[in-house]
Every structure is written in C-alpha cells, then in structure tokens.
C-alpha cells in the first residue's frame, strides 16, 4: 500500500518534501516514478540512480529517501502531484498529493 | 525485437578520447535507459554509466566520474559512451545494454550490444 | 558500494553433471540480483532477474534461489552449450556492482 499526505500547502518562494511510503510484505521496489499531472518530474531505481527531468533539475531534488524536494515554489506548481512504485512481483502502486501553492 | 549494434573497434594512444557509439535497431529508446559495461582482457564485467534518454541524464560509477560522457540522441535512437584521458588500462571490451523502465524495471540489462574493442596503445 | 563475491572462481564438470554456483553480497540485497552466462567473444546473456526469475527463452535447466547475502545459480544437467562464464550482479544499491565471474570449463 501507499501512505501519504493527500493535501500538504506551502508558501511561495520556499521549499516541500513530497513523501509517498510504500510498504509491502512481498513486493520489492524496482522504480519510483514522480509525475506532475502528466509531466514526469523524476525517476528512480538501483539500476539507474536519481535522474530528474531538465526542466526541473534546478528547483528539484530527490530525497530525502524516495520522496522529493521542491524548491523556489511558485503559484504554478500547485496542483496535483503523483508518485508511482513500480514493484516485483507486487505490480504497481500509485499516490496522489495534492499540493498548494500559497502567497506569501 | 531490438538490437543494439555498436560500432567499430578503435585504436587509440594514452592521453587521447574515444567516442563509442550505440544504436538500437528496430526500436526506440522511449521506454529504456541504456548502461555502459566494460570488461578488459581476460577480466570480469564493470558497471560504468547509465543514461536515461527521455531526460536526457546520466550517472556514473565513481572510478569513472570526471572522465566518461554518455549521451543519447532520442531522434536516431543512439547513444554514445566517450572515455577521455584514456591509459593502457583502458583497454577493454566496451558494452551498452538496454535496461526497462516503470513496470519492467525488475528485469535488468536483457539486451546488450555486440561490444566494441578499445585499445590503448602508444 | 556493495561487493559481490563468487565461488568457486573456475570449476570443471562433465556434460550430465548438475553444477552449482554461488554468489555472496557484502550486505543484504534482498533478492535484487541478477545471473548472467558470458561465452568466449561474446556479449552477456541476460538468464536470471530477481533472484529466481527465469528470463524468457532460457532453459529450465537453469534455476536461481536464495534472499539477503547468499545466492545460487543451479544447472540442474549440464550441456555442451553451457560451457562459459557466469556472472552474478546486484541491483539493490546504486551503483550496481557485478561478481567477479565463475568460468565453467569441460572436465
């Protein structure tokens, strides 16, 4: 299953964690994919490491853990944020944060 | 059903750069990243790099961090693996391998190319 | 980084035999390792993925088991075709790191 905060809010100009936590008894973690609405923003796995898309690699950076750190926030990256846990054999878990960009 | 055909083996001499290249034959790269391995004479296998076409992002092995560039071109489906400063130790068999990405990250490197022979030599 | 250690690092055995390979990780990794059968002038083969996976087109003479440190690649009745190097990889912690081979040779 995937465990996260659905809604999380943060000020213009600064910083948020996205987390999503992802336990299973059986499935291995073989790819984290992070989406904004349908953009991929970044994507991890042990085969490849972090790569982050060029569009966002000077205000994103992974972790910590599996999560993500948005940084120089603007009113435009409110919106709705996906993290998807490709797993082996478990298949895939998706988790939605939805993400409020505020004036500060 | 993809190949990966690298091409030709290079003679260089110590100091100097070598451009490997890697194309995939009868497919895209928009699902896959492609790693570089190398192996020197009589030796065993040694991760080098990875690039993740769709971004456009590489990372590297330690040992060769400063040294090694991969780069792909998403529009010919390429990638290339180029090694500068290069010694006698160098010398090797150099490999691409296609990795998955998203629902088949699990497999690994399930399709390699040919490789291509690098020697070093003054 | 993780180091992957192999035994034994050559062996001899007769078409037949059945041949046993083991891989050992420096830390747990689950069962995030892979199997790989090099011949001579040639490029890897992709057998095994996660520990026990056979990859599609291998022969199920070839089988892979163990979780955590302790791996093995089992050739349950060796043929001539089999003949060649094997090498494990874990793919637990970036950057992956492979073994450093077992060659299997005619007895």
């Known amino acids: 299953t995937i465990d996260t905060k659905r809604n999380i809010s943060a000020e213009e100009g600064g910083s948020v964690i996205l987390q999503c936590h992802f336990s299973s008894d059986t499935a291995e973690v073989t790819q984290v994919d992070w989406k904004q609405q349908d953009q991929l923003l970044a994507i991890y796995s042990v085969d490849l490491g972090w790569h982050v898309a060029s569009v966002f690699s000077d205000r994103v950076v992974p972790g910590p853990s599996l999560g993500l750190t948005f940084q120089s926030l603007t009113m435009n990256d409110t919106g709705e944020y996906f993290c998807t846990y490709h797993t082996y054999p478990g298949g895939i878990y998706k988790g939605r944060i939805f993400l409020k960009v505020q004036e500060s | 059903q993809v190949q990966l055909v690298q091409s030709g083996a290079e003679v260089k001499k110590p100091g100097s750069s070598v451009k490997v290249s890697c194309k995939a034959s009868g497919g895209t790269f928009q699902n896959y990243a492609i790693s570089w391995v190398r192996q020197a004479p009589g030796q065993g296998l040694e991760w080098m790099g990875v690039?993740?076409?769709?971004?456009?992002?590489?990372n590297y092995a330690q040992k060769f961090q400063g040294r090694v560039t991969v780069t792909a071109d998403e529009s010919t489906s390429t990638a290339y693996m180029e090694l500068s400063s290069l010694r006698s130790e160098d010398t090797a068999v150099y490999y691409c391998?296609?990795?998955?990405?998203?629902?088949?990250?699990?497999?690994?490197?399930?399709?390699w190319g040919q490789g291509t022979t690098v020697t070093v030599s003054s | 980084d993780i180091q992957m250690t192999q035994s034994p690092s050559s062996l001899s055995a007769s078409v037949g035999d059945r041949v046993t390979i083991t891989c050992r990780a420096s830390q747990s990794i689950s069962s995030y390792l892979n199997w790989y059968q090099q011949k001579p002038g040639k490029a890897p083969k992709l057998l095994i993925y996660a520990a026990s996976s056979l990859q599609s087109g291998v022969p199920s003479r070839f089988s892979g088991s163990g979780s955590g440190t302790d791996f093995t690649l089992t050739i349950s009745s060796l043929q001539p075709e089999d003949f060649a190097t094997y090498y494990c990889q874990q793919r637990y912690v970036f950057p992956p790191t492979f073994g450093g081979g077992t060659k299997v040779e005619i007895k």
């Open positions: 690039i993740v076409p769709i971004f456009g992002t590489a």
């Open positions: 391998a296609r990795l998955h990405l998203g629902q088949k990250a699990y497999y690994g490197m399930d399709v």
